[in-house]
């Protein structure tokens, strides 16, 4: 039975040209995390593997930085970066947990961070 929950940074907004940290945290399970994938819609941005370290997809290397921790930093944001981002935790023995973050990239300087929320 999957008992874990993923806490994410939730709905967030950031200014065009700025950067933002995408963070997820898996709790309430003793399952072992083997890998975390970061995806934007259907595109793989990055992988952090417990044994093999980080791999950033070549097409995102200039604008995506690993960390902090198992999180991901998006840099030089454009309005086109607006959308859904997913952290996918591969665990044993539970299986896969997915967290969702919605990022809105704003033209103005009125970028406010949304509240944290949980996805069971």
């Amino acid at each position: 039975m999957m008992t874990g929950t993923i806490e994410t940074t939730g709905n967030i907004s950031a200014e065009k040209g700025g950067s933002i940290i995408l963070q997820c945290h898996l709790s309430s399970t003793t399952a072992q995390v083997t890998q975390v994938n970061w995806e934007q819609q259907d595109q793989l941005l990055a992988i952090c593997n417990a044994d093999l370290g980080w791999h950033i997809s070549p097409s995102f290397k200039d604008r995506v930085a690993p960390g902090p921790g198992l999180g991901l930093t998006l840099q030089s944001l454009t309005v086109n970066d607006t959308g859904e981002y997913f952290c996918i935790y591969h665990t044993y023995p539970d299986g896969t947990y997915t967290g969702r973050i919605f990022l809105e990239v704003l033209e103005s300087s009125v970028a406010e961070h949304g509240a944290r929320f949980q996805i069971p």
């Epitope: 072992q32 044994d51 370290g53 980080w54």
Partner: antibody, heavy 120, light 107 residues
Framework: EVKLVESGPELVKPGASMKISCKAS????????MNWVKQSHGKNLEWIGL????????SYNQKFKGKATLTVDKSSSTAYMELLSLTSEDSAVYYC?????????????WGQGTLVTVSS | DIQMTQSPASLSASVGETVTITCRAS??????LAWYQQKQGKSPQLLVY???TLAEGVPSRFSGSGSGTQFSLKINSLQPEDFGSYYC?????????FGGGTKLEIK
């Protein structure tokens, strides 16, 4: 206390194969990946590859594919590296090494090293 | 593969002196860098990880710094036990690679 104890020095003939062992103690053997590192001429360090003792999964440095084969025996908490078709270039000290922790891919624990001399 | 270039290859210094060893990565490795010390005939020992975090039991005279592609290991007030070889290693993503080493000798 984490301990990695390797087998003793070996003198082998060119063309032969041989197996080095690394006995682990002081921690859960199946919970941590085992790495192997080659040190030539007492200087250059090269990562050979790793094995996950839990499932036997391996990842090799391209340079050592076909040269090294990594295996484990869970019942004795021992990792093995077989070196194939030995030449003088394979004369070196070989270390087993364990990561600090999951997602912490630096080598916190090392075996004492096994000196392999290839000579006719 | 990421290439790690260390300098100098060798260094002579006296007890009490301060020395700095540098390591350059062929591409951005952020702060994913470790330093090791190795004495003659012994295994490498972890000194620093994540570019600047001292491993357990490592004296505070050692310090690591840098990020991106340029890194350094500084040893203040050298002690007799500090002489030996030093290696950097990136821990960003496999294959892990090491610098060529710096041999620190007593002057």
């Amino acid at each position: 206390e984490v301990k990695l104890v390797e087998s003793g020095p070996e003198l082998v003939k060119p063309g032969a194969s041989m197996k080095i062992s690394c006995k682990a103690s002081g921690y859960s053997f199946t919970g941590y990946t085992m790495n192997w590192v080659k040190q030539s001429h007492g200087k250059n360090l090269e990562w050979i590859g790793l094995i996950n003792p839990y499932n036997g999964g391996t990842s090799y440095n391209q340079k050592f594919k076909g040269k090294a084969t990594l295996t484990v025996d869970k019942s004795s908490s021992t990792a093995y590296m077989e070196l194939l078709s030995l030449t003088s270039e394979d004369s070196a000290v070989y270390y087993c090494a364990r990561y600090a922790n999951r997602f912490e891919n630096w080598f916190a624990y090392w075996g004492q090293g096994t000196l392999v001399t290839v000579s006719s | 593969d990421i290439q790690m270039t260390q300098s100098p290859a060798s260094l002579s210094a006296s007890v009490g002196e301060t020395v700095t060893i540098t390591c350059r990565a062929s591409e951005n490795i952020y702060s994913y860098l470790a330093w090791y010390q190795q004495k003659q005939g012994k295994s490498p020992q972890l000194l620093v990880y994540n570019a600047k975090t001292l491993a357990e039991g490592v004296p505070s005279r050692f310090s690591g710094s840098g990020s991106g592609t340029q890194f350094s290991l500084k040893i203040n007030s050298l002690q007799p036990e500090d002489f030996g070889s030093y290696y950097c290693q990136h821990h960003y993503g496999t294959p892990w690679t090491f610098g060529g080493g710096t041999k620190l000798e007593i002057k």
